[in-house]
């Protein structure tokens, strides 16, 4: 930063609320799509360019004028793997977090014309190209269809689809949100011969119902009804099938072969939680018990003589946890070697740190190929010689991310590929590999401005800078920007990390108001090395507020001792640790302990509310947006993972002990702003309605705001601007700022 250390002498503007809301200073991305092992697509001025990775030269793949006469606004595009067709998506209508419906047209790149015959129907729920060639699978009205050629009629694979009841090839609400993080429940085999799919049955799942007010002219509000299993309620059931797309015909129904869950799953409620093709004729399925501390991986082979899939019990791999649940959020996916006879997977080791283990399909035990008091975040690529992974090992910073490669012939030979590239600017990397991992794009997202670079795996040399955000850097030189501090405190001999967004010209001899920005859900991380331009940037830059975040017990990427500390006890240690963090910050000498606030969204709204209702005396005020208030109101998959079942035999007592409502009396000591969208399909408005009722019942004065027809993100342009303006006023009033 230019300017002086003296705030009064710095005439530069600050980063304002308007700058945040209007996105005045935009981070530039470099979003590429690999189409081969040496080429990628990149959109520039609405032209789609194809780049050669080695040399950096480009040519126009598709001119922006190609679809001038199309008559629809194209939301997205997808090129077939053989490069012959482009799928155009329009009429996009959002459903939940990942799901949407849309219309699709297919453009023939050879003939340079739209295919007009046998079109995909409107309101299609999901479409995907086969991994090679140009077959298409799509889901419409909860049934699956396959196109062998874009201009040929579709073959109907399923006939049982029924809205809100039977879902073929797409997820229901809870599987979308909590299991697959996707609407798709279709999995092509590597060469596109087989199509695997899940079928979800929500017949017995209770419905959440809420009003949708819509346009002012609507006399009676619409009622939205969604099958949504709350904790302890009836769950969806799942079946799994594989269909051979080579055998499809219009005159006979497709034969889908079912693969049943292992016997150890069928004894009770269970989930399908991962599907991974190992080879053309081998598939791995992971199943998870409703009590999510026990999972089984099945490895199933196609038997050509019978046309069936066989899953040998001898090849089953059990993963369990004695201290909590399996996986960070679900069991991790396996990464198979080319022959499909072995795989690598991230699992917890004896010390409770998540590392890569090497499995052979016919052996129970695995060999850990990484170890240490740090964690592997993800396996990014696997070649015949190397495995590439992201971890937070470097400098013992859990909030950092770097790319490593490990030699498969000698696990002691590990190289960090990103650590020393730009160590001041770049400490948090993600990666995108080309099809066979010959090249990779590194995406550095902090602590400096984002930097995108291209590299060759042959010698790991940097080929070129793709985007360095130099234009933004130049603009921000003229702004008084906050600084970011990432450090740790030691509590009970354990390191706990925090971050602080510090006002420009921060002076540790002065006293600043502090806002604790909290999430604190299981396996969360709020203290990291990422550069962000957000509400906190405004609060620190313009209002001189320190915005801090703290990763206490329950947080992720630091081992199971920390993460599993809150097992079966949500609303306890993670709440207490936020209070303790604020106390520790108060002792640092630069915090005005009469002006400490807390805010959070979703799980963060729950923790905020539990903190404010704790009677600690540490916080003057706080804001809870879309909070959970009682775990029986939230969905089964997420809640039961950490809390078990709300039954007397299991964990009902703690379900009842961990509500916000039970702390209503203590809200008399704080200023509270409660906010929720009325059309929140995820954390239902019910949750805030019950907080409000409890507060009213004990005579607590508090502030509240609802956002009509907004969901969990409160993300429409007007609502987004309104909520942040409203929260800014509240915080400024709480801190007695002009």
């Amino acid at each position: 930063n230019k300017g002086t250390d003296d705030a009064t002498a710095d005439s530069r503007k600050t980063y304002t609320l308007t700058d945040y809301l209007k996105n005045t200073y935009r981070l530039k991305l470099y979003s590429l799509r690999w189409i081969s092992d040496h080429e990628y697509l990149y959109k520039q001025e609405n032209n789609i360019l194809v780049f050669n990775a080695e040399y950096g030269n480009s040519s126009v793949f598709l001119e922006n004028s190609t679809f001038d006469e199309f008559g629809h606004s194209i939301n997205d595009y997808s090129i077939s793997p053989d490069g012959q067709f482009i799928l155009l998506e329009y009429n996009y209508v959002k459903q939940w977090r990942h799901s949407y419906t849309a219309s699709y047209d297919i453009y023939d790149l050879n003939k340079r014309q739209l295919i007009t015959e046998e079109r995909i129907p409107n309101n299609t729920q999901w479409v995907t190209w086969s991994p090679v060639g140009h077959k298409l699978a799509y889901v419409w009205n909860n049934d699956i269809y396959v196109k062998i050629e874009p201009n040929l009629p579709s073959y109907r694979i399923t006939w049982t689809g029924k809205e809100d009841i039977i879902y073929n090839g797409i997820t229901d609400w809870v599987y979308e949100e909590e299991v697959f993080s996707a609407y798709s429940a279709l999995w092509w085999s590597p060469n596109g011969t087989f199509l695997a799919y899940a079928q979800f049955n929500d017949t017995e799942v209770p419905l959440i119902e809420y009003s949708f007010y819509s346009d002012e002219s609507l006399q009676y509000p619409k009622t939205v009804r969604v099958p949504y299993p709350k904790a302890g309620a009836v769950n969806p059931t799942v079946k799994f099938f594989v269909v051979n797309t080579d055998s499809l015909s219009s005159v006979t129904n497709a034969t889908s072969i079912q693969i049943t869950a292992p016997a150890s799953m069928l004894i009770g409620d269970h989930y399908l939680c991962d599907v991974t093709w190992a080879t053309q004729e081998r598939i791995s399925l992971q199943w998870l018990r409703r009590i999510q501390n026990y999972s089984v991986m099945d490895i199933c082979d196609y038997d050509e003589s019978s046309g069936r899939w066989n899953c040998l019990v001898a090849r089953q791999h059990i993963e369990m946890s004695t201290t909590g649940w399996v996986g960070r959020f679900r069991p991790s996916e396996p990464h198979f070697t080319l022959d499909g006879n072995s795989f690598y997977k991230i699992i917890s080791n004896e010390e409770g740190y998540r590392h890569i283990c090497y499995f052979q399909i016919d052996k129970k035990d695995c060999t850990f190929i990484t170890k240490g008091t740090w964690e592997v975040i993800g396996i990014e690529a696997l070649t015949s010689d190397y495995l590439y992974y992201i971890s937070n090992e470097y400098k013992g910073m859990p909030g950092g991310r770097n790319l490593y490669k490990i030699q498969l012939s000698d696990y002691t030979k590990v190289t960090c590929l990103s650590c020393e590239l730009n160590p001041e600017r770049c400490q948090y990397y993600s990666v995108s590999f080309s099809k066979e991992a010959k090249y990779y794009q590194l995406r550095c997202s902090g602590p400096g401005l984002p930097l995108y670079t291209l590299h060759s795996s042959v010698n790991d040399k940097g080929l070129r800078v793709l985007e360095d955000n130099s234009a933004l850097d130049k603009m921000l030189q003229n702004v008084q920007m906050p600084s970011k501090k990432l450090d740790f405190i030691i509590l009970n001999e354990t390191k706990f990390w925090y971050q602080m967004i510090l006002p420009p010209h921060f002076d540790k001899s002065k006293k600043y108001p502090l806002l604790l920005d909290v999430y604190a859900g299981p396996c969360s991380q709020k203290a990291d090395t990422v550069f962000r331009l957000n509400w906190a940037t405004y609060l620190a830059s313009t209002e001189n507020i320190i915005v801090a975040s703290f990763d206490g017990r329950g947080s992720g990427y630091q081992g199971d001792k920390i993460m599993h500390a809150i097992n079966r006890r949500l609303g306890t240690f993670e709440v207490e640790d936020q209070i303790e963090a604020a106390r520790q910050f108060s002792k640092m000498g630069f915090v005005d302990n009469k002006r400490i606030a807390i805010w959070g969204w979703s799980y963060g709204g729950y923790v905020t509310s539990m903190v404010l209702g704790s009677g600690s005396g540490v916080f003057k005020c706080g804001i809870a947006v879309a909070p959970v208030s009682r775990w029986e109101y939230y969905d089964s998959v997420y809640t039961e993972r950490y809390m078990g079942l709300p039954t007397p035999e299991d964990n009902l007592d703690h379900y009842r002990n961990s509500t916000v409502m039970s702390r209503a009396e203590n809200f008399k000591q704080v200023e509270y702003l409660l906010i929720h969208g009325t059309a929140d399909d995820n954390v239902h408005f019910q949750q805030s309605a019950q907080i409000s009722k409890a507060l009213v019942d004990v005579g607590v004065d508090f502030q509240a705001m609802w956002y009509t027809d907004e969901d969990h993100g409160i993300a429409s342009s007007t609502a987004h601007q309104h909520i942040y303006t409203h929260m800014s006023h509240f915080i400024k009033q709480c801190f007695s700022l002009p």
């Epitope: 201009n151 040929l152 009629p153 055998s247 015909s249 219009s250 005159v251 006979t252 034969t255 003589s305």
Partner: antibody
Framework: EVQLVQSGGGVKQPGETLRLTCTAS????????VHWVRQAPGKGLEWVGV???????DYDAAFMSRVTISKDTSKSTAYLQMNSLRAEDTAVYYC??????????WGQGTTVTVSS | DIQMTQSPSSLSASLGDRVTITCSAS??????LNWYQQKPDGAVKLLIY???NLHSGVPSRFSGSGSGTDFSLTISNLEPEDIATYYC?????????FGSGTKLEIK
């Protein structure tokens, strides 16, 4: 390489039973259906029936009562059995691989002559 | 059953000629029509599937068109090896039915 090799033709007496064999290579009979058609001398092609990959069968109504199509997947072989042969069953019989809604590979054909 | 009517039943053309064979269905069959070539020795092969799609390995001089009830097969530049009988076949509904065939000869 995909191939269909036919055998079992020849001269038959009226009233006898015919059993034709179609041996497949380069693909699996559990994946692909096998159809049978016939062509009487100097005439066009007439569809007889099909056995699908999953073992289900469909027949032309004209042959339903006296034709059975079967397969032995372990031998990669499909069979056409026709009972109560008559003179008008004299024809070249073809088996074909079903690929979606067309026949992409045909056997070489086998001649059946029904004569007393 | 769906009846398939092919015309002409035979035709004679010179090498290099453009030849068109037509096929009509007794009811609408959308694009579910295939064309086959039967050589004098009896060997049969697929030429065109789903009205207009060229089967792999088939020379590009063969093309198909049509939908609904009326279809055609065109050979744009007749070659000696094209001497054969050509059949259309509907695949929309069982029983599958074929046209009566068009025998193509060289003048």
């Amino acid at each position: 390489e995909v191939q269909l090799v036919q055998s079992g033709g020849g001269v038959k007496q009226p009233g006898e039973t015919l059993r034709l064999t179609c041996t497949a290579s380069g693909f699996s009979l559990t994946t692909y259906g096998v159809h049978w058609v016939r062509q009487a001398p100097g005439k066009g092609l007439e569809w007889v029936g099909v056995i699908w990959g999953d073992g289900r069968t469909d027949y032309d109504a004209a042959f339903m009562s006296r034709v059975t199509i079967s397969k032995d997947t372990s031998k990669s072989t499909a069979y056409l059995q026709m009972n109560s042969l008559r003179a008008e069953d004299t024809a070249v019989y073809y088996c074909m691989r079903n690929r979606h809604d067309w026949f992409d590979y045909w056997g070489q054909g086998t001649t059946v002559t029904v004569s007393s | 059953d769906i009846q398939m009517t092919q015309s002409p039943s035979s035709l004679s053309a010179s090498l290099g000629d453009r030849v068109t064979i037509t096929c009509s269905a007794s009811q609408g069959i959308r694009n579910s029509l295939n064309w086959y070539q039967q050589k004098p020795d009896g060997a049969v092969k697929l030429l065109i599937y789903y009205s207009s799609n060229l089967h792999s390995g088939v020379p590009s001089r063969f093309s198909g068109s049509g939908s609904g009830t009326d279809f055609s097969l065109t050979i744009s530049n007749l070659e000696p090896e094209d001497i054969a009988t050509y059949y259309c076949q509907q695949s929309i509904k069982l029983p599958f039915t074929f046209g009566s065939g068009t025998k193509l000869e060289i003048k």
